[in-house]
């Protein structure tokens, strides 16, 4: 293959791969017809002048995961056909000016996961055809004005995982073609008004895991094409009334892990395409009427791990397409019987880890498609007669860790649980808390003949019984409903992220695992 170095493998498709710790310099001679060269996991520490001079047909060059700390300015001379250059995962602290001169065809430049301390306008001034620039995972503390002014064709810019404390409002002004801008995991405390005004084609903006406290009211007003906006894990305590007003294309918005105390009606919208709204881990204490009414296509609404103690009966108005509603780990004591009435397509509702003492008999009256209800770890002593009778698709019901009062009034619930076993997931069984003679016994195996007669007046209304289990053979014998939407927190889905940190999500959804970035 036109002379393949012994340390490398060369394929018929003009691909050369050189790997191994024994490599300390760019191997020679490289095949003159090589179109793709990968130098990975070696002990190369520097690139000298023109090591690739004789492979001018090269289109892709990956020099990754090495010990590379120094590059001579002319290292990439004669690579006029190069379209893809990756120097990711090395030990570069500085880039020589002019390093990328002559790379007129370069479209993708990956400099991520190095130790770069600064970039200058002169670094990229020759890269007029660049479409993708990856600078995440470095030590950049600021971006000078003009750094990207010549990159007018850039569509993807990743500055995540640096040490940026502020952004100049002019730094992105010439990037009219930019579609993806990632600034996650920096130290930004605020974003000046106008910073994103020139980004009229922006589709994704990742600002999560910074220290942003305030959002300027018009910060996103020029970003009409924005589809994904990640604002999670910041210090945002309030949302200006008009901040999301000009985002008609938005389909993903994450606000979890902030300090939001309240949500005003109309704050979200109009966003006809928004499918998911993640608001867990905030300080929200109540939900007013019509707060989500502009989100007609919303399918996933996560409000868990807040301090919600009151939900207005019309809080969920307009959410006719909602499939998943997470309200777990809040401070709810009571729910209005009509609060879920508009959620005709709801499939999963999680209400665990609240202080619910009772549920209205009609709480699920219009939510006929419910498949999973999480009610564990509340203060429930009983449930109204017939509360689940019409839920023919229900196949997961969690009731454990409640102080069930096992007097004769518990029999309808006990019977329902027993007769509906084939439709319910195998889970921790509800246990009696009172009276004392049955405390600790499983609710479904208490001796009904010694169940204490009830002496209380029911606190909750019940509605007429309906057939609890239609006589059809179509119910499955075993069940395991898992809503993938609810099970996974939003992963900011970056193609250039190689590792995703997965955390045990029992506290976020109470079901399985999620990535909460």
């Amino acid at each position: 293959y036109h002379g393949c170095p012994s340390e490398c493998t060369c394929s018929r498709a003009s691909q050369v791969e050189c790997t191994g710790a024994r490599i300390v310099a760019v191997p020679t001679p490289l095949p003159w017809n090589a179109m793709s060269l990968q130098i990975l996991n070696t002990h190369i520490t520097e690139l000298n002048e023109s090591p690739f001079l004789n492979i001018s047909a090269l289109i892709a060059l990956r020099i990754e995961k090495n010990e590379l700390s120094r590059i001579t300015p002319g290292a990439f001379r004669n690579l006029g056909s190069l379209r893809y250059l990756s120097l990711a995962n090395n030990k570069l602290q500085v880039l020589p000016i002019g390093l990328f001169q002559g790379l007129d065809s370069l479209e993708s430049l990956l400099l991520s996961s190095n130790q770069l301390l600064q970039i200058q306008p002169a670094h990229f001034s020759q890269c007029s055809n660049l479409k993708e620039l990856q600078l995440h995972g470095n030590h950049l503390e600021y971006i000078p004005d003009g750094a990207f002014d010549h990159l007018v064709g850039l569509t993807k810019l990743n500055l995540g995982k640096n040490s940026l404390t502020h952004i100049s409002p002019r730094v992105f002004q010439h990037l009219g073609n930019l579609q993806v801008l990632r600034l996650y995991e920096n130290r930004l405390t605020d974003i000046p008004m106008g910073t994103f005004d020139g980004l009229v084609n922006l589709q994704e903006l990742a600002l999560q895991q910074n220290q942003i406290g305030l959002l300027s009211p018009g910060l996103f007003h020029n970003n009409h094409n924005l589809q994904r906006l990640y604002l999670s894990n910041n210090h945002i305590s309030q949302l200006p009334p008009s901040v999301f007003m000009q985002l008609p294309q938005l389909n993903r918005l994450t606000l979890f892990g902030n300090s939001l105390k309240e949500l005003s009606p109309g704050i979200f919208g109009p966003m006809p395409n928004l499918r998911e709204l993640w608001l867990y881990d905030n300080h929200i204490s109540s939900l007013p009427d019509n707060v989500f009414s502009n989100l007609r296509q919303l399918q996933v609404l996560i409000l868990s791990r807040n301090q919600i103690s009151f939900i207005s009966p019309g809080a969920f108005n307009g959410l006719t397409e909602l499939r998943e509603l997470s309200l777990h780990t809040n401070a709810l004591q009571d729910l209005d019987g009509n609060v879920f009435r508009m959620l005709a397509n709801l499939q999963n509702i999680s209400l665990q880890n609240n202080r619910l003492r009772q549920l209205p008999g009609n709480i699920f009256a219009n939510v006929n498609g419910l498949m999973a209800i999480q009610l564990q770890n509340n203060q429930l002593e009983n449930l109204p007669l017939g509360i689940f009778d019409h839920l023919g698709k229900l196949c997961e019901l969690r009731l454990y860790d409640n102080p069930w009062r096992c007097d004769s009034d518990i029999l309808p619930l006990r019977n329902w649980l027993l007769l509906n076993q084939p439709r319910l997931g195998t889970d921790t069984v509800p246990v009696c808390f009172s009276p004392a003679n049955v405390r600790g016994q499983s609710l479904i195996i208490i001796n009904v003949n010694v169940a204490v007669p009830s002496v209380h007046v029911p606190e909750v209304p019940s509605y007429p019984e309906t057939p609890w289990y239609p006589d059809t053979p179509s119910y499955p014998d075993t069940t395991s409903v898992s809503s993938t939407t609810e099970l996974t927190s939003p992963v900011e889905d970056y193609t250039d992220l190689t590792t995703i940190q997965v955390t045990d999500d029992r506290s976020v959804w109470g079901m399985t695992q999620a990535q909460s970035g």
């Epitope: 007769l419 084939p422 195998t426 889970d427 499983s442 195996i445 057939p467 014998d477």
Partner: antibody, heavy 113, light 111 residues
Framework: QVQLVQSGAEVKKPGASVKVSCKAS????????IHWVRQAPGQGLEWISY??????KYNERFRGRVTMTRDTSTSTVYMELSSLRSEDTAVYYC????????WGQGTLVTVSS | DIVLTQSPDSLAVSLGERATINCRAS??????????MNWYQQKPGQPPKLLIY???NQGSGVPDRFSGSGSGTDFTLTISSLQAEDVAVYYC?????????FGGGTKVEIK
């Protein structure tokens, strides 16, 4: 005390129907399931169906031939079996609760031409 | 359907001795961590009587000499000290899923 009292013995011809009643007393009628089980002479027990809150569930072997109803005003449950055959000759029992904790005395249904 | 197989078909035990009846299910009858296996006693000319429910819980008024054990597919009814009035046919029954099914019965007699 809890009691389930069933109607008396029946003799039926093949193809006919029989309706057996089970009157409950001594407990809150609507709080418990009522099952029907039968036992052919010298044989074991076979579950037929149950009723609870007007919802019913049937053994597929009897589907289309058995109908369960109840009258809450008299605390009575009825089991009607149609298209009788000789192999339906058995003692028919009603039993209370999911765990069959109380049983009626049984009703002998004889199917013979 | 879940098939229950009882063994032995019949059992002769001396008064005061232990009697053990086994019941094997064709699939697990466990749910919620509870085994939905029940045991009934039937004397000639009488309806069955609930002895044990949910594998190990005694029915009302059932003498302490009757006990149940097991989980999953294998279950046992034990009469610790057989009395004359215990002569009967004993049935196991699963109530995990419809159709609820009974074992074929075990006849217990005095040796």
């Amino acid at each position: 005390q809890v009691q389930l009292v069933q109607s008396g013995a029946e003799v039926k011809k093949p193809g006919a129907s029989v309706k057996v009643s089970c009157k409950a007393s001594g407990y809150t009628f609507t709080s418990f399931v009522i099952h029907w089980v039968r036992q052919a002479p010298g044989q074991g027990l076979e579950w037929i169906s149950y009723i609870y809150n007007d919802g019913t569930k049937y053994n597929e072997r009897f589907r289309g031939r058995v109908t369960m109803t109840r009258d809450t005003s008299t605390s009575t449950v009825y089991m009607e079996l149609s298209s009788l055959r000789s192999e339906d000759t058995a003692v028919y029992y009603c039993a209370r609760d999911y765990y069959f904790d109380y049983w009626g005395q049984g009703t002998l249904v004889t199917v013979s031409s | 359907d879940i098939v229950l197989t009882q063994s032995p078909d019949s059992l002769a035990v001396s008064l005061g001795e232990r009697a053990t009846i086994n019941c094997r299910a064709s699939e697990s009858v466990d749910y919620y961590g509870i085994s939905f296996m029940n045991w009934y006693q039937q004397k000639p000319g009488q309806p069955p009587k609930l002895l044990i429910y949910a594998a190990s819980n005694q029915g009302s008024g059932v003498p302490d000499r009757f006990s149940g054990s097991g989980s999953g597919t294998d279950f046992t009814l034990t009469i610790s000290s057989l009395q004359a009035e215990d002569v009967a046919v004993y049935y196991c029954q699963q109530s995990k899923e419809v159709p609820y099914t009974f074992g074929g019965g075990t006849k217990v007699e005095i040796k």
